[in-house]
């Protein structure tokens, strides 16, 4: 950090300001040195003596050039659902962030105050919007022709396999089951397939575009910390 060379306090010229890394002391009516990050003012300046700075004690810090009488206390230790991404030092506060599989439900200036587990979409529902550091997963019901058979915070709805002959039709939570003749896997939810008789296809004949059409938007789940809603599980 930039070094501050000690000097006798001085009265600024009329219309002039103190230099950078200095402050105007109203009592002394002098420009005085600030203390560097990691320090605080032990003794304030006078007309004849400059600020006396001292190092911050353990578990306290100052991040900025300052003339505060006491250093700030570092935040409390990170909770079990958090990881410490920045340790408490004399120059910086501890920063806690959410561990994988969790998101920040209540943030603070730096890091996170409260973490919550990412919502898991139950079978029949897939991830519409993945979780981020600061937002929960949004689940949606699997559209016709797609399914999800997992309880997951990452799995999306996948297309049913296309059967030459269907043994068991697929639904929102289960893939189609084909008879012993080898199936051809649909490549994408909206893939267009060659026409064939209805009886030889999976349960749905019309490819469905993703994301699903307007009526299913009512199933989008709210953001933020909330009790498990339809399509999600707290497990």
């Amino acid at each position: 950090l930039p070094a501050q060379v000690a000097f006798t306090p001085y009265a600024p010229e009329p219309g002039s300001t103190c230099r950078l890394r200095e402050y105007y002391d109203q009592t002394a009516q002098m420009c005085c040195s600030k203390c560097s990050p990691g320090q605080h003012a032990k003794v304030f300046c006078t007309k004849t003596s400059d600020t006396v700075c001292d190092s911050c004690e353990d578990s306290t810090y100052t991040q900025l050039w300052n003339w505060v009488p006491e250093c700030l206390s570092c935040g409390s230790r990170c909770s079990s659902d958090q990881v410490e991404t920045q340790a408490c030092t004399r120059e910086q506060n501890r920063i806690c962030t959410c561990r994988p599989g969790w998101y920040c439900a209540l943030s603070k200036q730096e890091g996170c105050r409260l973490c919550a587990p990412l919502r898991k979409c139950r079978p029949g529902f897939g991830v519409a919007r993945p979780g981020t550091e600061t937002s929960d997963v949004v689940c949606k019901p699997c559209a016709p022709g797609t399914f999800s058979n997992t309880t997951s915070s990452t799995d999306i709805c996948r297309p049913h396999q296309i059967c030459n002959v269907v043994a068991i039709p697929g639904n929102a939570s289960m893939d189609a089951v084909c008879t012993s003749t080898s199936p051809t896997r649909s490549m994408a939810p909206g893939a267009v397939h060659l026409p064939q008789p209805v009886s030889t296809r999976s349960q749905h004949t019309q490819p469905t575009p993703e994301p699903s059409t307007a009526p299913s938007t009512s199933f989008l789940l709210p953001m933020g910390p909330s009790p498990p809603a339809e399509g999600s599980t707290g497990d």
């Epitope: 950090l1 930039p2 070094a3 060379v5 000097f7 001085y10 600024p12 010229e13 002039s16 300001t17 103190c18 230099r19 950078l20 890394r21 990050p37 991040q63 900025l64 050039w65």
Partner: antibody, heavy 118, light 108 residues
Framework: QVQLQQSGAELARPGTSVKLSCKAS????????MQWVKQTPGQGLEWIGA????????RYIQKFKGKATLTADKSSSTAYMQLSSLASEDSAVYYC???????????WGQGTSVTVSS | QIVLTQSPAIMSASLGERVTITCTAS???????LHWYQQKPGSSPKLWIY???NLASGVPARFSGSGSGTSYSLTISSMEAEDAATYYC?????????FGAGTKLELK
């Protein structure tokens, strides 16, 4: 390594405003003052002011009060200078420079050329 | 404010020649806060000498600086082609910081 990346050249009409940026990397942005300097062929190098991104404290010389406004965005480590009510005499190259030991400007941006013309 | 006067404004020097550029302050300046910058056409200034006599990183040892009070100087012991540039002195002993008008050093 420390780098200061300034925004591209500006061509502006008299009376309008421009906002120049200076993106810092390679050091703790909030711990160092960022200074701004104007350079013209006639006037040479002229200090405009400085900002401390840590707390937003800013200083200006009298001549540039009301002309220049310094801001800083901690999240993107970027310092900004807005120049308002532009006139032909504001045409210059503007530099951002980091305040280092003993108030020496130890790292400089590449400069942004501002041309004010009708 | 403190006015810095550089001399000469322009000068030419031959390869190997000793070069001295001076910077005179209108009032006394602490040597700690007197600096020099080098600038080449189309480039930004570079810190060259800080606190009167300390060479910035990468500056060749043929450069030196000295002075106190109101009189400061930058010296090149043996001019080289790459030294052709404009040199500025700068003070931040008191606000506002000020610069000299520059000395343009050309290769003869």
């Amino acid at each position: 390594q420390v780098q200061l990346q300034q925004s591209g050249a500006e061509l502006a009409r008299p009376g309008t405003s421009v906002k120049l940026s200076c993106k810092a990397s390679g050091y703790t942005f909030t711990s160092y003052w960022m200074q701004w300097v104007k350079q013209t062929p006639g006037q040479g190098l002229e200090w405009i002011g400085a900002i401390y991104p840590g707390d937003g404290d800013s200083r200006y010389i009298q001549k540039f009060k009301g002309k220049a406004t310094l801001t800083a965005d901690k999240s993107s480590s970027t310092a900004y200078m807005q120049l308002s009510s532009l006139a032909s005499e504001d045409s210059a190259v503007y530099y951002c420079a980091r305040d280092g030991n003993y108030y020496a400007m130890d790292y400089w941006g590449q400069g942004t050329s501002v041309t004010v013309s009708s | 404010q403190i006015v810095l006067t550089q001399s000469p404004a322009i000068m030419s020097a031959s390869l190997g020649e000793r070069v001295t550029i001076t910077c005179t302050a209108s009032s006394s300046v602490s040597s700690t806060y007197l600096h020099w910058y080098q600038q080449k056409p189309g480039s930004s200034p570079k810190l060259w000498i800080y606190s009167t006599s300390n060479l910035a990183s990468g500056v060749p040892a043929r450069f030196s600086g000295s002075g106190s009070g109101t009189s400061y100087s930058l010296t090149i012991s043996s001019m080289e082609a790459e030294d052709a540039a404009t040199y500025y002195c700068h003070q931040y002993h008191r606000s506002p910081p000020t610069f000299g008008a520059g000395t343009k050093l050309e290769l003869k």
